[in-house]
């Protein structure tokens, strides 16, 4: 079953006389989404070699994964606050129908899969409350979503273990740079 | 107490690969959060980070190195390895494998502080 | 991409107080608390002094102090002690997931 936020030793909730701030909150959210992604990724690289392959052979996988990169002013070089949490909110609104494709990838953790997705959603709607510049955030497309997982789907056995092996890296990766970005805010 | 051993041959030739070993004693390195670096030191010279394994197994390289080098791990054997390829007189030095976690290294994917290290083990490129 | 600047020597008397220095940039020192210290006697590995800029790790004297401005992070020992002579340094986490460490700085114990 899904850990909840604060049950983990490495997540010490704070005293119930301090009421988390919205910025705790989503700083522990993000904690417990990265919790959630290292579980999945166990029982993936119980089932496949795919945690042996090399992040080149990876990339080879034409997926569009969202990634930090210096324009979005997310690296402390060139920190724009704004800037950054659309980059943050865009990049995980694209994540979500990666998210929709790894739930049925795991047959042990199908739970976490779950929780993981959910809690993203919540993070979305936390982060939108914090970000005044809505009007920059571009929701993907449905359509296009939906002809993606189609795609993914589709996939053979390898591909799409490949395929979860990645998202899950990617998501990992993005999280943590959203993390060290929204601890300068 | 968590204890850290480098092993591996003391002189490699140039162009060839050096490998080396690090077993984990006192501790599992399969631990949650808890990353595992290699850092070198050349004689009479600084420290140079080289590359860290994290909890899920995610490889992280110093940029200059990349091309060269190879960090893998063996849980069942509380072993992480590093192959340098195509190794020239100027990799002469002593390697340090340590391990790096602390506070919210983990979520933050900050490995630079390394709280355990080996004793080091001294690698000679020379034909 | 070159390290994190350190003077290579500084000195003092058992009993005083010296800083060493530790210059980065926006991309590494600059970016949070990401900054730890190591002490390394001659012939042994380092040691883990300082983290989080600040935080002395597991069994370390309150003697040695961290702290950030800015760009430049700095390690501070009082009450000098002739055991505290060896080489110091900073290190730091750079974007994308890398480290770099300073050149080092010899502490010299007078007297």
């Known amino acids: 079953a899904p850990v909840l936020p604060g049950e983990d030793s490495k997540d010490v909730a704070a005293p119930h006389s301090q009421p988390l701030t919205s910025s705790e909150r989503i700083d522990k959210h993000i904690r417990y989404i990265l919790d959630g992604i290292s579980a999945l990724r166990k029982e993936t690289c119980n089932r496949s070699n795919m945690c042996e392959s090399s992040k080149e052979a990876l990339a080879e996988n034409n997926l569009n994964l969202p990634k930090m990169a210096e324009k979005d002013g997310c690296f402390q070089s060139g920190f724009n606050e704004d800037t950054c949490l659309v980059k943050i909110i865009t990049g995980l609104l694209e994540f979500e129908v990666y998210l929709e494709y790894l739930q049925n990838r795991f047959e042990s953790s199908e739970e976490q899969a779950r929780a993981v997705q959910m809690s993203t959603k919540v993070l979305i709607q936390f982060l939108q409350k914090k970000a005044k510049n809505l009007d920059a955030i571009t929701t993907p497309e449905p359509t296009t979503n939906a002809s993606l997982l189609t795609k993914l789907q589709a996939q053979n056995q390898w591909l799409q273990d490949m395929t979860t092996h990645l998202i899950l890296r990617s998501f990992k990766e993005f999280l943590q740079s959203s993390l060290r970005a929204l601890r300068q805010m | 107490e968590v204890q850290l051993q480098e092993s591996g041959p003391g002189l490699v030739k140039p162009s060839q690969t050096l490998s080396l070993t690090c077993t984990v004693s006192g501790g599992s390195i399969a631990t949650s959060y808890y990353a595992w670096s290699w850092i070198r030191q050349p004689p009479g010279k600084g420290l140079e980070w080289m590359g860290v394994i994290d909890y899920d197994g995610d490889t992280y390289y110093k940029p200059s190195l990349k091309s060269r080098t190879s960090i893998s791990r063996d849980t069942s054997k509380n072993q992480f390895s590093l192959q340098l390829s195509s190794v020239t007189p100027e990799d002469t030095a002593v390697y340090y494998c340590a391990r790096a976690g602390l506070g919210d290294s983990y979520y933050l994917g900050t490995y630079y502080a390394m709280d355990y290290w080996g004793k080091g083990t001294l690698v000679t490129v020379s034909s | 991409q070159a390290g994190l600047t350190q003077p290579p020597s500084v000195s003092g008397s058992p009993g005083k107080t010296v800083t060493i220095s530790c210059a980065g940039t926006?991309?590494?020192?600059?970016?949070?608390?990401?900054v730890s210290w190591y002490q390394q006697l001659p012939g042994m590995a380092p040691k883990l002094l300082i983290y989080?800029?600040?935080k002395r790790a597991s069994g370390i004297a309150d003697r040695f102090s961290g702290s950030k401005s800015g760009n430049t992070a700095s390690l501070t020992i009082s009450g000098l002690q002739s055991e505290d002579e060896a080489d110091y340094y900073c290190a730091s986490y750079r974007s994308l997931n890398n480290v770099v460490f300073g050149g080092g700085t010899h502490l010299t114990v007078l007297g």
């Open positions: 926006t991309s590494d020192v600059g970016t949070g608390n990401f």
């Open positions: 989080d800029v600040n």
